[in-house]
């Protein structure tokens, strides 16, 4: 055998963000020579789980019948072949929603905004939290974090967008979280529909105006401009 065994591929179905109590299956795909698959979870004693391969031996299934806090975290998998253990897979981050009560998402001054103007999405939680996430439906990179600088607990986070274009239109939700586990999120807020109308100067703004690559707007991270307000929160792009 020349060189190390190729690393396996790790993924989750139906996805890696799972509501409390729902089932999820983690798959690890290696090679046809695999004899055993092992799943390790960061900050937990190893091995987290072991499974025999499914025919034709190139993958294994790790089932979670009911998602709880215990299963949220960062995973890697390996496979063992006759010549030894593979390299670890790229990590899979399994996130559980429903750990805390849902925050409230609102738009200031209004969810109906004229292109070129400014709007701020406000995510508010009943209890103090130190991380807030804004998610746009059907965006390939939907997460925008605001995280407190020094672990200071906040009741809200502001997500300013300026200038608004049609790219910003769509359905948003927000989540809140505590810093001790970024894999545990609140229930999602109720959805907020942000409607962007054309202006006299720019009746139909180009949807690709605010992005710098050839990809379409839904393939880009949400990129509001403007400084983070004086809340002690810092912006993180995921």
């Amino acid at each position: 055998q020349a060189g190390p065994l190729p690393k396996p591929t790790l993924w989750a179905e139906p996805g890696s963000v799972i509501s409390w109590g729902n089932s999820v299956t983690i798959w690890c795909q290696g090679t046809l020579e695999a004899r055993e698959y092992r799943l390790d979870k960061e900050e937990s004693p190893a091995p987290w789980d072991r499974q025999n391969p499914l025919e034709p031996k190139n993958k294994a299934r790790f089932s979670i019948p009911s998602m709880t806090e215990d299963y949220a975290g960062r995973y890697r998998c390996y496979y063992r072949s006759p010549v030894g253990w593979s390299q670890p897979s790229d990590p899979l981050e399994l996130v559980m929603t429903g750990a805390y009560s849902k925050p409230t998402l609102s738009a200031l001054p209004s969810p109906l905004v004229t292109s070129g103007k400014s709007v701020t999405l406000l995510c508010q939680s009943r209890s103090p939290m130190d991380t807030f996430l804004l998610i746009k439906e059907r965006a390939a990179h939907p997460l925008l974090h605001l995280r407190s600088e020094h672990g200071a607990q906040q009741h809200q986070a502001e997500f300013p967008m300026s200038p608004v274009t049609s790219v910003h239109g769509g359905t948003y939700r927000c989540f809140s979280s505590h810093g001790f586990s970024h894999y545990l999120l609140s229930h999602p807020s109720d959805p907020l529909e942000l409607i962007v109308s054309g202006s006299l100067e720019d009746p139909r703004p180009s949807p690709t105006r605010s992005v710098s690559t050839a990809a379409g707007p839904e393939d880009q991270p949400l990129m509001p401009t403007g400084s983070v307000p004086h809340s002690g929160l810092r912006r993180h792009w995921e």
Partner: nanobody
Framework: EVQLVESGGGLVQPGGSLRLSCAAS????????MGWYRQAPGKQRELVAA???????KIGDSVKGRFTISRDNAKNSVYLQMNSLRAEDTAVYYC???????????????WGQGTQVTVSS
């Protein structure tokens, strides 16, 4: 064939210490999380502590700061050091082995026969 063998249990006064040992076959020890459960009369079985193959440990909330777990790879053995013992620590202590997710589900693949620990004056 007995694959996990515990020792070290006994009677100890409150505030005292005990060290439990569990010897495992090499094939089980080398590829599994090793840990300890306990069961007091009339109570549910409770995970006390576990240690992974790379040495990462998890300690139950009720014994944190008093109990430690360690593994000796050369001897295929795992140890539970119990300090500042209390009457409520009285139970049968079981050595167990398996993947960690099975510990969370209270269903490790391998179990010892158990050793009695009694804390009483």
């Amino acid at each position: 064939e007995v694959q996990l063998v515990e020792s070290g249990g006994g009677l100890v006064q409150p505030g005292g210490s005990l060290r439990l040992s569990c010897a495992a076959s090499e094939s089980i020890f080398s590829s599994n999380v090793m840990g300890w459960y306990r069961q007091a009369p009339g109570k549910q079985r409770e995970l006390v502590a576990a240690v992974g193959i790379q040495g990462l440990t998890k300690i139950g909330d009720s014994v944190k700061g008093r109990f430690t777990i360690s593994r000796d790879n050369a001897k295929n053995s795992v140890y539970l050091q119990m300090n500042s013992l209390r009457a409520e620590d009285t139970a049968v202590y079981y050595c167990a082995a398996g993947a960690y997710v099975r510990f969370l589900q209270q269903s490790p693949d391998y179990w010892g026969q158990g050793t009695q620990v009694t804390v009483s004056s």
